[in-house]
């Protein structure tokens, strides 16, 4: 149980107060985070709260400024980057968003060793992607659709590419479905590790079905945005990776990597590009049915100037119960000797475990292994290998972070940060510098969150960079509700939940109970972190209990888990809510005729089905920004879990589970569906016929749509939206306004 | 090729004292930590003592803890055992082991003849 | 400590026989599991590390499998030199403690 910073004397709680909406949607009582943006072992650069950029020596104990404000208020820069050798800065500004990682800037390059911007061979504007070279000061950068070289700020560039098109090739940059569902970044370009060569990826869309949909904007007629999206089944892109050496680009110019012929053999994916040394490179590859990825280490031949990728150096993952990897397929990290490589993957048992391959992953040695997952490889070192966890105290929603040792006697395996701040503390991330010589881990909670500094070698903490006083006092005449995490045990499943309650929580009581549920396959709710949300106001202030529940095809819990939904979502999802709620229930304080249903996106689908399950448990739900049938979804995210809309594989089940299919069950609830017009990622068209089937079936309904706003409905649109919706449920729960 | 050379090993009255000896070869030296483990007559094996490459870490069993002293010199390649206060139970075949690493564990991938320790008086 | 419990304690068999020797750790070890074989008057051979690796050197008749608490080697066809003594040690927390051994006879 998770209880917040307790208020045991009764008089103080005259002078507290609920939350109110208002508090959540000014962002009252947000939380700060420290991350170090690591120049060197012991040094790191941070932007003041004045907006100068400091550097800041961990041994010297010294900080001086690099760049003043005044230099970054003089372009409106919004960001910075320090080329390697110190010597000149890019100055981000201009930033506009395009879809969830990428934008576009101007970019500024200022010479520290002048004071001045480079003038002359300017970069051109708007530029997609920019960064430096690993070591020096080269610059590569993405500018409509191709990719240009600059040994330095002030050369004037080499183009690297020229086939660059909008919506047609992309280089150096991934299309839409790569961004989203593979590659999650903004790039598809990376450094060698000194700089020598540079690889990138080409995607080819020229194939691809177009997505459609009107931009209102302010104009007489409304914009049409295009982007090619494929949905299931649809034709995929082609990627294609190159190699250029950057010293001398015009030599031999950019060499093909070759794709594994088993993986070439029919359509596939490239998941992820690794650095070994500045002549060895590993690619990781995907069949489009992703139960096999392939790993391939190749080598620069000098004598050929190409780069060759031998089958010895092959190294095939198979699942044969679900889909390859977790979300994505984990990525190695290399040791020392730049052959061998740690990975995160199934055992035996079915928990995600690093294991240490030296020749064949047949003979990989398995350096974890338990009833619970390793998660990330931070790093490795000569002497340790630092990973995240959930295995203390056997809660899957907790993070810690451990230290095995390498190549020290006797070896030792640490728990870092499990005793660190026990009850504060136990969700944590980590950020190293250079050999790991010194890390800060941000911890998101439980309690409040807290930065910290420490030494690599003792794991000693240096200080404190960010605590939230400010937070801390904030909210100590506030009533903050309670937090519990329990476990279920139903039929050999273990439904893992979070119960928020209201403050004056009384088990004799009867308590409206709101489900909020996300549920997508390898996600993770129900976890050990802080946060002042609208759902703690509606415990604070309303009075409602709120559950999140972590049913199957969730994360971290191992495969039998997370592997249940493969090829049948919208099932298993739905049936662990209505379960849980049926615990709810059972356990004697939830008013089991005010029972609520929210999600957003997946868990907008699942709200969806959950309401239409025809069980009465519930009496009114939301589904924001819901997916209503999976041939509407992108085709890398939904093969994944559901294989193909074809006759001969799997598209039965994608016309089993629409929303729409079940629209006559929606009849007995009071439902809200809410999209914005604009979402690229989850198109309107699934509320929309989501919409029509209701309406074909005479079923009433709430409807909202939010004009121009995409998948995450930000700035004004939020304040709506949750005031929406919280008329909506006070409503449906007979609170009074 | 590794080898392990154990020598020191004999007949000695309880409460005497005795020091083993390991001549390595064939490997560097220093780069390894070092152990020696133990066979009663008839018995099983046990794990006594261990050294780390650079002789800076010491482990022992409880059954040996504050009677035997783990030593090495890499300037000779030679590993050390100094047991004193010896007890009939310490009659064994001592084996001086080569250790290697692999990510948080470690395994005796070489090993020496033994030498046989006998305490009885 | 954590205690290393193997069985059989002994086992007849017959060349050519597919053998299976267990070793059970009282708490999780994770993989940190080696086998060894000794014959009479010798000293003890590395087999397998890791639980599963196969020392080089070693013919691949011999195999391991297991994670946390349980763990088997195998030995698909056996040969007349393979008929000795068998121990599995953990190499997960100091003391570093070995299993009572398998004697393994022919039948």
């Known amino acids: 149980i998770v209880l917040r910073p307790s208020r045991v004397h009764n008089s103080e709680e005259n002078t507290m107060r609920a939350l109110t909406l208002k508090d959540i949607l000014n962002g009252t009582f947000s939380y700060k985070t420290f991350f170090p943006n690591w120049i060197s072992g012991q040094e790191y650069l941070h932007q003041s709260a004045d907006n100068n950029i400091v550097l800041y020596n961990i041994e010297t104990g010294q900080s001086y400024t690099i760049l003043s404000n005044r230099t970054m208020k003089s372009v409106n820069a919004s960001n910075y980057g320090l080329s390697p050798d110190r010597q000149f800065v890019y100055l981000e500004s201009d930033y506009s968003k395009l879809w969830r990682y990428s934008y576009t800037a101007t970019y500024y390059i200022y010479d520290l060793s002048n004071g001045e911007f480079v003038r002359g061979n300017e970069l051109p504007r708007p530029i997609q992607y920019l960064c430096w070279s690993p070591v020096g000061s080269k610059l590569a950068y993405v500018y409509q659709n191709n990719i240009y070289l600059k040994q330095r700020p002030g050369d004037p560039p080499f183009q690297i590419t020229f086939n660059g098109r909008e919506n047609k090739i992309f280089n150096g940059i991934p299309d839409w479905v790569y961004e989203e569902e593979m590659l999650a970044t903004k790039y598809a370009l990376w450094w060698s590790p000194n700089g020598k060569f540079l690889a990138y990826a080409e995607f080819n869309d020229t194939d691809i079905p177009v997505i459609a949909y009107s931009y209102y904007g302010d104009e007489q007629y409304p914009r049409t945005i295009n982007i090619p999206y494929p949905k299931a089944g649809a034709k995929n892109p082609v990627v294609r990776i190159f190699i250029i050496d950057t010293t001398y680009p015009a030599y031999v110019g950019p060499q093909e990597v070759p794709v594994p012929a088993m993986i070439a053999s029919s359509d596939y994916y490239f998941s992820w590009l690794t650095w070994v040394t500045d002549e060895r490179v590993c690619l990781q590859w995907l069949k489009r049915v992703q139960n096999v990825s392939v790993l391939s280490i190749c080598d620069f031949r000098e004598d050929w100037q190409t780069w060759d990728c031998p089958k010895t150096q092959e190294h095939i993952e198979e699942s044969r119960t679900g889909w390859a990897g977790g979300f994505f397929v984990s990525t190695p990290v290399f040791s020392y000797d730049a052959i061998s490589y740690y990975k995160i993957f199934s055992d035996k048992d079915g928990y995600k475990h690093i294991h240490y391959i030296k020749d064949t992953v047949e003979n990989a040695i398995q350096i974890t292994s338990g009833k619970w997952e390793a998660i990330n490889i931070f790093r490795v070192t000569q002497d340790s290998l630092f990973y995240s966890s959930n295995e203390f105290e056997e809660y899957p929603g907790r993070r810690n972070i451990y230290r095995i040792s390498i190549g020290s006697y006797p070896p030792s395996k640490k728990c870092v940060t499990c005793h660190l701040r026990k009850e504060r503390c136990q969700y944590y991330t980590a950020s190293f510098s250079d050999y790991a010589k010194y890390y800060a881990l941000v911890c998101y909670g439980p309690g409040i969150p807290i930065s910290t500094l420490h030494d690599g070698r003792t794991d000693q903490e240096i200080k404190i960079l960010e605590e939230n006083k400010e937070l801390e006092n904030a909210l100590k005449n506030i009533q903050l509700p309670k937090e519990e995490i329990k476990k279920l045990e139903v039929d050999e499943i273990t439904l893992w939940y979070k119960m928020i309650l209201p403050p004056q929580f009384d088990r004799s009581k009867k308590y409206p109970l709101l489900i909020q549920v996300y549920g997508g396959p390898c996600s993770q709710s129900v976890r050990s972190v802080f946060a002042v949300n609208w759902i703690s106001y509606l415990a604070s202030k309303e009075g409602m209990v709120i559950a999140l529940v972590d049913g199957r095809g969730t994360a971290f819990q191992g495969d039998k888990l997370l592997y249940a939904v493969y090829r049948k979502l919208g099932v298993y999802e739905v049936e662990d809510q209505i379960t849980a709620v049926r615990k709810f229930i059972e356990m004697g304080f939830i008013d089991e005729k005010r029972i609520a249903i929210w999600g957003w996106s997946y868990g907008g689908y699942v709200s969806s089905l959950a309401l239409a399950s025809g069980t009465g448990l519930f009496k009114c739900g939301i589904a924001v920004a819901p997916v209503s049938s999976w041939e509407y979804y992108a085709s890398v995210y939904t093969e994944r879990f559901m294989g193909l809309p074809t006759k001969d594989d799997n598209l039965e089940h994608y016309k089993n589970s629409t929303v729409m299919a079940r629209a006559e069950y929606f009849r007995n609830v009071d439902y809200l569906l809410i999209h914005g017009t604009a979402d690229d990622n989850v198109h309107f068209q699934n509320s929309a016929q989501i919409a029509k089937a209701l309406v074909n079936a005479q079923v009433d309904f709430q409807a909202m749509w939010y004009s121009d706003q995409n998948h995450g409905l930000s700035g004004l649109s939020t304040n709506h939206l949750y005031t929406h919706m919280t008329h909506f449920l006070k409503q449906c729960f007979s609170l009074s306004d | 090729e590794v080898q392990l050379l154990e020598s020191g090993g004999g007949l000695v009255q309880p409460g005497g004292s005795l020091r083993l000896s390991c001549a390595a070869s064939?490997?560097?030296?220093?780069?390894?930590?070092m152990s020696w483990v133990r066979q009663a007559p008839g018995k099983g094996l046990e794990w006594v003592s261990g050294?780390?490459?650079?002789?800076?870490?010491?482990y022992y069993a409880d059954s040996v803890k504050g009677r035997f002293t783990i030593s090495r010199d890499n300037s000779k390649n030679t590993l050390y055992l100094q047991m004193n206060s010896l007890r009939a139970e310490d009659t064994a075949v001592y084996y001086c082991?080569?250790?290697?690493?692999?990510?948080?564990?470690?395994?005796?991938?070489?090993w020496g003849q033994g030498t046989l320790v006998t305490v009885s008086s | 400590d954590i205690q290393m419990t193997q069985s059989p304690s002994s086992l007849s068999a017959s060349v050519g026989d597919r053998v299976t020797i267990t070793c059970r750790a009282s708490?999780?070890?994770?993989?940190?599991l080696n086998w060894y074989q000794q014959k009479p008057g010798k000293a003890p051979k590395l087999l397998i590390y890791?639980?599963?690796s196969l020392q080089s050197g070693v013919p691949s008749r011999f195999s391991g499998s297991g994670s946390g608490t349980d763990f088997t080697l195998t030995i698909s066809s056996l040969q007349p030199e393979d008929f000795a003594t068998y121990y599995c040690?953990?190499?997960?927390?100091?003391?570093?403690?070995f299993g009572q051994g398998t004697k393994l006879e022919i039948k």
């Open positions: 890791a639980a599963s």
């Open positions: 050294i780390s490459g650079s002789g800076g870490s010491t």
């Open positions: 082991a080569k250790i290697s690493f692999y990510p948080g564990g470690t395994y005796f991938d070489y």
């Open positions: 064939g490997f560097t030296f220093s780069s390894y930590a």
């Open positions: 040690q953990q190499s997960y927390s100091s003391p570093y403690t």
């Open positions: 708490q999780s070890i994770s993989s940190y």
